[in-house]
């Protein structure tokens, strides 16, 4: 379970029940392989193939592939946030990890289902998904990194965070943030949220709002509350410092457009 010694918090996704699946569009016919949408998405989309750019917010890598930042990347988390990872052979990644980060295997990893294998390293299987055959319940990644995920329900944003246990990388992440104090207020809020969440054990992706930041750490124009299934979350527009701009909100029925505002 989540409270087992040595295991940090694991994300709980909304279950993909029949009602959620009924909201999905038929996937494109041209895909070589279909995978679930990013984050807690229930619908199917084309998998990325080997060598394609990937990240936390992008489609998933195909079977046998993992999304990995480049080895010489100074800020691997930021690279994944920015979609600057690459889909690489998972067995090669595992060998590299075993060499760099020796760790005992996580429970439940022995019998990954096809869906799990195709998920890519930026996505661990959802805890309460109702259509997993092997249903490994708590299935943390080997990589011992903190990961932010955004699932797309139409254009909405739904975040979830994975934490690994007793991780030296947690300290590395914190020291990285000290090196980057020139980053904007959004980035700082995001890191504060992550550091706060470090102490929680099981995270609900709908129970936390992680802001939508640009590359410089300022707020992106459009911010959204998490979504449920394919139901859009409440969205609003902000300036670069995160201050809401009046008159630009949506309760989920129609998209909110923030394009004309100076908040980049």
């Amino acid at each position: 379970g989540a409270s087992s010694a040595g295991l940090g918090p694991v994300v709980r996704c909304e279950p993909c029940d029949a009602r959620a699946l009924a909201q999905c569009a038929p996937p494109p016919a041209v895909c070589a392989e279909l995978v679930r949408e990013p984050g807690c998405g229930c619908c199917l989309t084309c998998a990325l193939s080997e060598g394609q750019p990937c990240g936390i917010y992008t489609e998933r890598c195909g079977s046998g592939l993992r999304c990995q930042p480049s080895p010489d990347e100074a800020r691997p988390l930021q690279a994944l946030l920015d979609g600057r990872g690459l889909c690489v052979n998972a067995s090669a990644v595992s060998r590299l990890r075993a060499y760099l980060l020796p760790a005992p295997p996580a429970p439940g990893n022995a019998s990954e289902s096809e869906e799990d294998r195709s998920a890519g390293s930026v996505e661990s299987p959802s805890v309460s998904s109702t259509h997993r055959v092997s249903d490994p319940k708590f299935h943390p990644l080997h990589s011992k990194i903190i990961i932010i995920k955004k699932g797309h329900a139409k254009d909405s944003q739904r975040y979830k965070v994975d934490y690994e246990s007793q991780s030296t990388d947690t300290q590395n992440f914190s020291s990285e943030s000290k090196r980057e104090t020139e980053y904007g207020p959004c980035r700082r809020e995001m890191e504060d949220t992550l550091n706060h969440l470090k102490f929680l054990n099981v995270l609900s992706p709908r129970g936390v709002h992680i802001p939508n930041c640009d590359k410089k750490g300022f707020y992106k124009k459009k911010q959204c509350r998490p979504s449920k299934g394919r139901k859009r979350g409440f969205c609003w527009c902000v300036d670069k410092y995160g201050q809401p701009l009046p008159g630009y909100t949506t309760k989920g029925k129609e998209d909110v457009h923030c394009y004309s505002m100076q908040s980049k």
Epitope: L21, C24, P27, A29, L34, L44, V133, K231
Partner: antibody, heavy 116, light 108 residues
């Protein structure tokens, strides 16, 4: 409760067109797409196509592309399926169903008979 | 296009007996995205199982789905009189989604 109610049976001549309606109630129509599935007498199920509830996107099975048109009227929460250039092979029960990959609610079916 | 082959074509059983229906795919069904439907004469199909093993809302627990890859099974642990009809499997792991030809479960 969720309901999909289809229009009545039709008898058509070869070469003609048929338009079947499917009125939805009990849920937010724009949140779910509608698929159309047909079943020839004594035969299995065949997916024809899908349209989003907001009438923005359509996907058609290759076999029916160019011959079928799916539309919706969001003001009345009704989906329509028009099939053109009918032949006797198109004699079947036509079902509307909620969803694009899994179909959780179905209409009662509309029998279309094509006969000269 | 993924072809689904169901067997047997017809299953003759008595109420109270166990029914085992098979669905075999021509290629591996990605993510075990397979559903089962029940259809009674003159009625539309009804969703029973999705994701190979998850029961749809309101479906009794005597219905269970299992399997992965290319081989899937629907089991009815104890047939009730209302369970007789035709059962279809459907894959939605590749596009377009396809149905099997059906298995008829009839009263012996």
């Amino acid at each position: 409760q969720v309901q999909l109610v289809q229009s009545g049976a039709e008898v058509k001549k070869p070469g003609a067109s048929v338009k079947v309606s499917c009125k939805a109630s009990g849920y937010t129509f724009s949140d779910y797409g509608i698929s159309w599935v047909r079943q020839a007498p004594g035969q299995g199920l065949e997916w024809m196509g899908w349209i989003s509830g907001d009438n923005v996107k359509t996907t058609y099975a290759k076999k029916f592309q160019g011959r079928v048109t799916l539309t919706t009227d969001t003001s009345t929460s009704t989906a329509y399926m028009e099939l053109r250039s009918l032949t006797s092979d198109d004699t079947a029960a036509y079902y509307c169903a909620r969803g694009g990959i899994v179909f959780d609610y179905w209409g009662q079916g509309t029998l279309v008979t094509v006969s000269s | 296009e993924t072809t689904l082959t169901q067997s047997p074509g017809t299953l003759s059983l008595s109420p109270g007996e166990r029914a085992t229906l098979s669905c075999r795919a021509s290629q591996s069904v990605s993510g075990n995205y397979l559903a089962w439907y029940q259809q009674k004469p003159g009625q539309p199909p009804r969703l029973l199982i999705f994701g190979a093993s998850s029961r749809a809302t309101g479906i009794p627990d005597r219905f269970s789905g299992s399997g992965s890859g290319t081989d899937f099974t629907l089991t009815i642990s104890r047939l009730e009189p209302e369970d007789f009809g035709v059962y279809y499997c459907q894959q939605y792991g590749s596009s377009p989604g396809t149905f099997g030809q059906g298995t008829k479960v009839e009263i012996k």
